[in-house]
């Protein structure tokens, strides 16, 4: 299953990065799981994941650094709390969970660049 | 003549970006000109330029947004005063001016990403 995501995104100076993950669904899935993976060197780690019913909202766990909304075959993902050290390749993984058959789709990754802000001068 | 430069550089939150431009000199040049070009869409504009004698310092004009140092066949370039709207491809062009023959080398460009900082809160 094909998954498209932007090649590059810049995090805001507040450490927030948003991008769209779009998938070409081969069937009529009712339950979809979206996972954001971070690839550094050859290590792949899970950043966040959410399962949603088509037509319903995308809900990440309360302590997740991700939020998102879904519309048809598009998922708008936002990752917060990013620091310069979090710069890296963020891969969107989409799984059509129900009904069978299961389908897997993995995007090519979005390179997110994060720049730490300069501290503001102390107010006297 | 081959010119190497990094593919991507992030400007600091103060709008400063630095990168190295390295050239493979085919001869014993004594006078070298370095130009930074910005490519946006199909438009190429000159950002700054400096001519230097091998072994001497690289001197840009006083009102230039560029500064730099040279060491052998390497030039360390710094561009200041960058804003988010200045994000783009910055190409390093090197010309061996003297003695003849003249040589031209153009790098593949460095994508410089610039994020505007959040304004600091007003001090009351």
């Amino acid at each position: 299953m094909h998954v498209a995501q932007p090649a590059v995104v810049l995090a805001s100076s507040r450490g927030i990065a948003s991008f769209v993950c779009e998938y070409a669904s081969p069937g009529k899935a009712t339950e979809v799981r979206v996972t954001v993976l971070r690839q550094a060197d050859s290590q792949v780690t899970e950043v966040c994941a959410a399962t949603y019913m088509m037509g319903n909202e995308l809900t990440f766990l309360d302590d997740s650094i991700c939020t998102g909304t879904s519309s048809g075959n598009q998922v708008n993902l936002t990752i917060q709390g990013l620091r310069a050290m979090d710069t890296g390749l963020y891969i969107c993984k989409v799984e059509l969970m129900y009904p069978p058959p299961y389908y897997l789709g993995i995007g090519n990754g979005t390179q997110i660049y994060v720049i730490d802000p300069e501290p503001c001068p102390d107010s006297d | 003549m081959h010119v190497a430069q990094p593919a991507v550089v992030l400007a600091s939150s103060r709008g400063i970006a630095s990168f190295v431009c390295e050239y493979a000199s085919p001869g014993k040049a004594t006078e070298v000109r370095v130009t930074v070009l910005r490519q946006a869409d199909s438009q190429v504009t000159e950002v700054c330029a400096a001519t230097y004698m091998m072994g001497n310092e690289l001197t840009f004009l006083d009102d230039s947004i560029c500064t730099g140092t040279s060491s052998g066949n390497q030039v360390n370039l710094t561009i200041q005063g960058l804003r988010a709207m200045d994000t783009g491809l910055y190409i390093c062009k090197v010309e061996l001016m003297y003695p003849p023959p003249y040589y031209l080398g153009i790098g593949n460009g460095t994508q410089i990403y610039v994020i505007d900082p959040e304004p600091c809160p007003d001090s009351d």
């Epitope: 299953m1 094909h2 081969p26 339950e31 799981r33 996972t35 993976l37 792949v44 780690t45 899970e46 994941a49 399962t51 891969i91 993984k93 799984e95 969970m97 129900y98 069978p100 058959p101 299961y102 389908y103 897997l104 993995i106 | -």
Partner: antibody, heavy 118, light 107 residues
Framework: QVQLVESGGGVVQPGRSLRLSCAAS????????IHWVRQAPGKGLEWVAV????????DYADSVKGRFTISRDNSKNTLYLQMNSLRAEDTAVYYC???????????WGQGTLVTVSS | EIVLTQSPGTLSLSPGERATLSCRAS??????LAWYQQKPGQAPRLLIY???SRATGIPDRFSGSGSGTDFTLTISRLEPEDFAVYYC?????????FGPGTKVDIK
């Protein structure tokens, strides 16, 4: 380190039942799908079943559908395969294997032998 | 179901030689294809995933290529420990399927 250990294999008569277990350690169990894959003596690998994440979504090979049930207990980091109405052709080494974040099976157990014979 | 066909069934080679193994899918699996190595009495070991990415700890003499329906596993110079059975597997959709395997044995 990641470890998967199968147990529960043995000799069983045709038509009877057996339950295999797979104890997982060294990773966040609930974040991974887990497969059962089997290998008949001298034969190749055959996919049997998979269970995903919280255990609600499962898939089976046609050859075991209606006879085998895959389940998991995320609180115990354990995977199960309940095998009913066993046949001689179910004789195999049964492996559990973890699904890597990008989809392949990156860690496998050592396998447990199930022999269905009268 | 996606059927995977591997060829040859057996490959007889000497240490130091190059091994080229083929896997063909009955329909496109994009790049969702993995290669595994299995030695007698052992569990399979992941070598290649995503058609061409080497798994952690796998020597660079192993390489994978291809996409869609035709895939290749290449072992550039066979070491004694490389003589084993190699399986391809598609993991892009269920039912998940394995190829029948290629045995690489010593000539």
């Amino acid at each position: 380190q990641v470890q998967l250990v199968e147990s529960g294999g043995g000799v069983v008569q045709p038509g009877r039942s057996l339950r295999l277990s797979c104890a997982a350690s060294g990773f966040t169990f609930s974040s991974h799908g887990i497969h059962w894959v089997r290998q008949a003596p001298g034969k190749g690998l055959e996919w049997v079943a998979v269970i995903w994440y919280d255990g609600r979504n499962k898939d089976y090979a046609d050859s075991v559908k209606g006879r085998f049930t895959i389940s998991r207990d995320n609180s115990k980091n354990t995977l199960y395969l309940q095998m009913n109405s066993l046949r001689a052709e179910d004789t195999a080494v049964y492996y559990c294997a973890r699904v890597a974040p990008l989809g392949p099976l990156d860690y496998w157990g050592q396998g447990t032998l199930v022999t269905v014979s009268s | 179901e996606i059927v995977l066909t591997q060829s040859p069934g057996t490959l007889s080679l000497s240490p130091g030689e190059r091994a080229t193994l083929s896997c063909r899918a009955s329909q496109s699996v994009s790049s969702y294809l993995a290669w595994y190595q299995q030695k007698p009495g052992q569990a399979p070991r992941l070598l290649i995933y995503g058609a061409s990415s080497r798994a952690t700890g796998i020597p660079d003499r192993f390489s994978g290529s291809g996409s869609g329906t035709d895939f290749t596993l290449t072992i550039s110079r066979l070491e004694p420990e490389d003589f084993a059975v190699y399986y391809c597997q598609q993991y892009g959709r269920s039912p998940f399927t394995f190829g029948p395997g290629t045995k690489v044995d010593i000539k």
